[in-house]
């Protein structure tokens, strides 16, 4: 059987074919190739002469058990190699000799007993090794690392490490590497001798389920003093042993390190004294939890010199009363517990995501809700109930906001948007928001983008709300139920790029409207029940038209609207995928290609 | 079409059969079987994938007594620091996990529920296998 | 510059329902924030009573439950107190007042004095 | 609810001389805790937020502390324009509430 041509002359998949030989039918040009689950076997010298363009090869589980010297040598620009999965027992010293660029080794599962024995030191440009899921017992980085010094991610996951002495990483001291991600989670630890870690610097530690209890996790933290880690990630897994007590404690010895940001991840335990359990934490600039089960997070400190705090998949007793004075992002998001969002007071905020909550708001949106004036970034998206009751006073700076598939209630009620001058994207797709009120988007003169899909208009007529928006780039009004539109609805939109008015109820297609959009590149018509045009005489789209869909809509091919039909053709240039352009009537048509047709009048007869 | 039998239990019987056509081999077993009443126990899945897990999701669609509800997503890897540890598995890389898992006051009627389970992951979304789950209920069997 | 102003009649009967009315200006009270009653009895502390949020939401003290209405016209930017079956314990100065989110009232109106006596 | 104890109830003290407050709270409240000064026949006015933060145009004698249940108002060098009655309140959780005063004479 063939392999799978990707991308002709580039990428070839070659997956579960039953090879038990590298392939010789392939392009030497071969850039990508996937060898996996063939039974390989055995890699001799120079297996990948024919590729000797080759930057990815893949051989995840090709039951390799032998690779010899100079396996892979005429691959000098292969920058991936996935070796995943082999039951590998022989490997040559000079295996990977030739891979002058190898940037990322994968070789997971592979039974490698020890780092010490594995002949890489030459790969000058290696930048990610994993060899997670292995035998290794020993975390004694070897003096080849020293080599190795653009390597940034080392994954060590899944091993048999259980101890870390000081001699381990003495060559990070002959050479920081100052970019160095390290996963040790899932490796039985019991031990860190104190000082091991001592003015080492790492870019990120993550230690998840490396201990099988509070005791062994606090002596072991505490072998991390003089630790330097940009970022520090701690936590379990939900379907790994977890910890059976978990206390204040267990994070005293984090205060002897100097943490820049820090993530708990995945915690099987209920917390509830919080100040405490984090006292050692309160000057990282980044604050993380994620899938955590916390009572009160009202008892964070005013002072927390937090600029980011991410609460990620926690549940909680009631809506978390924030007050941080630092705080500049606070992402918050797919949480569940308190249903009602109450108060918070951040007076530096900048960024805010409250998406995915289900939360109701009584009120929105006003500097009062957030405590600052700061903020440029909200996004209120897949929450319950939000009630518009203030016109976003306060709140002058934003730029972004994202309702979509929110609830929005009273928004024909007011100008609700009526502050927000420098607002660039707004998004209310969704938000059940049916627009009764012409002034809907009154004081948006800076606003680039508008999604309202899947909205609805009064008695389905989309009438000139658009009239301030002089800046706009990209409409979407699609799922609206729309039937018609004042021919002057889009006169000022003289920026529009793309406009989509796909999944609508138009009968008929009108190039008047459009007249003015001089920067229209896109236009979207697909899913209507377009069966002819409105005027018999159509008029040219703005010059500037790139694309227009016209797909799936009712297609009348009947010699009344001759004109309409030979019009669609005449703008065949702009079509997109023309082959779903098809007739619905009349029945002896229906399914055919529109462009296909042969329009004369002898069609009907 | 091959059915694969998973467990019986007081109240269930349970099967599955593959609904793609590359019919990966995986394992399932449960512990104790699932009652339908009230449940608690332990799922262990052994399976080779074909691709990376990361931001692994489920599309769940079911079908109690002939009538569908609507499509559910479960999102099961976000795609950094996930809850599982298996959300790091490489395509290839063995995955031999234990999942405890417990529900309780769910009165279901008696009858046949379908739940197809289509396992999406990785960037580009690929299909990574597809299973028909088969639970038959009957309340009052001992 | 946001002021307040309380106005309501300073006596009241006992058992009667004492009626207040706080002027907002320089801020619109449906534009943020949330508008509460404090009172304060003659040489006592203060005792805060309940709010009236932006969005017209209510909410109020446990003790006064039963008792207490508050209520807003939009239109003349003022929120009203009602306090029904007054006795002579209700006696005190009554001060509107707004809240910041840091749960704490840096502006207040004067005080209105109010006394509950047949 | 949360109940706040303020002591002493009454300090007389000369001018110049440093006037400290207590305020406990009958539980932890971390720093959610307000000061104000009353004068008489006048409003409250607030004077610092968050147990430390003064108010903008607050004089500088003015300085709070502590967290979690004790709490601590600090005039440094009394003035004659300090005599007043001094509240704490809870900025925590509903209802809110307040302490029973400490009122500051001048001798």
């Known amino acids: 059987e063939p392999c799978v041509e990707v991308v002709p002359n580039i990428t070839y998949q070659c997956m579960e074919l039953n090879f038990y030989k590298i392939p010789d039918n392939l392009p030497f040009s071969t850039k990508n190739l996937d060898l996996s689950f063939n039974p390989l076997r055995h890699l001799g010298s120079y297996s990948f002469f024919s590729f000797p363009e080759l930057q990815v090869l893949d051989l995840s589980r090709c039951e390799i058990q032998t690779i010899e010297d100079g396996a892979y040598q005429s691959l000098s620009h292969l920058s991936t190699l996935i070796l995943t999965g082999n039951p590998i027992q022989s490997l040559a010293l000079g295996a990977f000799s030739g891979l002058s660029s190898l940037q990322k080794l994968v070789a997971v599962e592979t039974n490698l007993a020890s780092l010490e024995n594995f002949p890489i030191g030459h790969l000058k440009t290696l930048k990610e090794l994993n060899v997670a899921h292995n035998l290794i017992q020993s975390f004694k980085l070897p003096e080849y690392f020293s080599n190795l010094t653009n390597l940034e991610h080392l994954d060590l996951s899944s091993n048999k490490i259980q101890s870390i002495y000081c001699t381990d990483l003495r060559v990070l001291h002959q050479m920081p590497l100052l970019n160095l991600s390290l996963d040790l989670s899932l490796n039985p630890m019991n031990f860190i001798q104190p000082g091991a870690f001592k003015e080492i610097r790492l870019h990120k530690l993550t230690l998840r389920n490396n201990f099988d209890s509070l005791n062994v996790m606090k002596t072991c933290i505490q072998g991390l003093a003089g630790l330097e880690v940009h970022r520090l990630v701690l936590g379990e897994f939900r379907n790994e042993g977890n910890l059976e007590k978990f206390d204040k404690s267990a994070l005293e010895g984090l205060c002897n390190l100097t943490i820049e940001e820090f993530r708990l991840a995945y915690l099987d335990y209920y917390l509830d004294d919080i100040i405490d359990l984090f006292n050692c934490l309160t000057n990282v600039s980044s604050f993380s939890l994620v899938s955590v089960t916390i009572e009160r997070v009202k008892d964070f400190s005013y002072n927390f010199g937090w600029q980011h705090l991410e609460l990620v998949n926690c549940k909680f007793g009631q809506f978390p009363t924030l007050k941080l004075k630092s705080l500049k992002r606070l992402t918050f998001t797919s949480n569940k517990g308190g249903n009602a969002f109450s108060e918070v007071d951040l007076p530096s905020l900048e960024f805010l995501d409250l998406s995915r909550n289900g939360l109701s708001f009584k009120g929105c949106c006003s500097q009062s809700d957030f405590g600052t004036t700061s903020l440029k970034y909200l996004d209120l998206s897949f929450n319950g109930v939000i009630t518009m009751s203030s016109n976003f006073l306060g709140l002058e700076q934003l730029e972004h906001l994202d309702f979509q598939h929110s609830n929005l209630k009273q928004m024909s009620e007011f100008s609700v948007f009526l502050s927000l001058r420098n607002l660039i994207y707004l998004d209310i797709s969704h938000t059940h928001t049916r627009v009764a009120f012409n002034g809907i988007f009154n004081g948006l003169s800076s606003l680039e983008v508008l999604k309202m899909a899947g909205n609805s208009f009064q008695e389905n007529f989309l009438p000139d709300i658009f009239t301030e928006l002089r800046n706009l780039t990209f409409l979407d009004l699609s799922q609206c139920q729309l039937e018609q539109l004042s021919p002057t609805a889009f006169n000022s939109l003289s920026s529009l790029q793309v406009l989509n008015m796909s999944h609508n109820n138009f009968f008929s297609l009108d190039t008047f409207p459009y007249k003015c959009l001089n920067s229209l590149q896109v236009l979207d018509y697909s899913l209507n029940h377009i069966m002819t045009s409105k005027k018999q005489e159509l008029q040219h789209f703005p010059s500037s038209l790139a694309f227009l869909n016209l797909t799936q809509n009712d297609f009348a091919c009947t010699c009344e609207h001759q004109s309409f039909l030979q019009w669609i053709k005449d703008q065949r240039q702009l079509l997109v995928e023309v082959e779903r352009m098809e007739c619905a009537t009349p029945s002896d048509k229906q399914g055919m290609p529109v462009l296909s047709l042969n329009i004369t009048c002898q069609m009907n007869k | 079409q091959k059915q694969y039998w998973v467990c019986n239990s007081s109240d269930a019987s349970i099967s599955y059969t593959y609904c793609d056509k590359m019919q990966y081999p995986i394992s399932i077993n449960v512990n104790p079987c699932i009652e339908l009443k009230r449940s608690k126990g332990l799922l262990h899945i052994f399976y080779i994938p074909r691709r990376d897990l990361k931001q692994l999701y489920f599309n769940l669609y079911i079908t109690v007594n002939t009538m569908n509800l609507p499509k559910r997503k479960e999102v099961i890897c976000r795609g950094s620091d996930d809850d599982y540890s298996f959300c790091r598995a490489l395509k290839g890389e063995t995955v031999n996990t234990t999942i405890s898992f417990s529900f309780k006051g769910i009165k279901f009627s008696k009858g046949k529920y379908k739940c197809v389970v289509e396992a999406i992951s990785g960037s580009p979304e690929e299909m990574l296998f597809c299973l028909e789950f088969v639970i038959l209920h009957q309340p009052n069997s001992n | 510059q946001v002021q307040l102003q309380e106005s309501g009649p300073g006596l009241v009967k006992p058992s009667d329902t004492l009626s207040l009315t706080c002027a907002v200006s320089?801020?619109?009270?449906?534009?943020?924030?949330?508008w509460h009653w404090i009172r304060q009895p003659p040489g006592k502390g203060l005792e805060w009573m309940g709010y009236i949020h932006y969005s017209g939401y209510t909410d109020f003290n446990p003790s006064l439950k039963t008792r207490i209405t508050i209520s807003r016209d939009t239109s003349k930017n003022q929120f009203s107190l009602k306090l029904s079956s007054v006795t002579a314990v209700d006696t005190a100065v009554y001060y509107c007042a707004r809240k910041d989110p840091s749960d704490a009232f840096p502006y207040w109106g004067q005080g209105t004095l109010v006394t509950v006596s047949s | 609810e949360i109940v706040l104890t303020q002591s002493p109830d009454f300090q007389s003290v000369t001018p110049k001389e440093k006037v400290t407050i207590t305020c406990r709270a009958s539980?932890?409240?971390?720093?959610?805790l307000h000061w104000y000064q009353q004068k008489p026949d006048q409003s409250p006015k607030l004077l610092i937020k968050y147990a430390s933060h003064a108010i903008s145009g607050v004089p500088s004698r003015f300085s709070g502390s502590g967290s979690g249940t004790d709490f601590t108002l600090t005039i440094n060098s009394l003035e004659a324009e300090d005599a007043a009655t001094y509240y704490c309140?809870?900025?925590?959780?509903?209802?809110?509430?307040f302490g029973g005063g400490t009122k500051v004479e001048i001798k």
């Open positions: 320089g801020y619109s009270i449906t534009g943020g924030y949330s």
């Open positions: 539980q932890s409240i971390s720093d959610h």
């Open positions: 309140q809870n900025g925590h959780s509903f209802p809110l509430t």
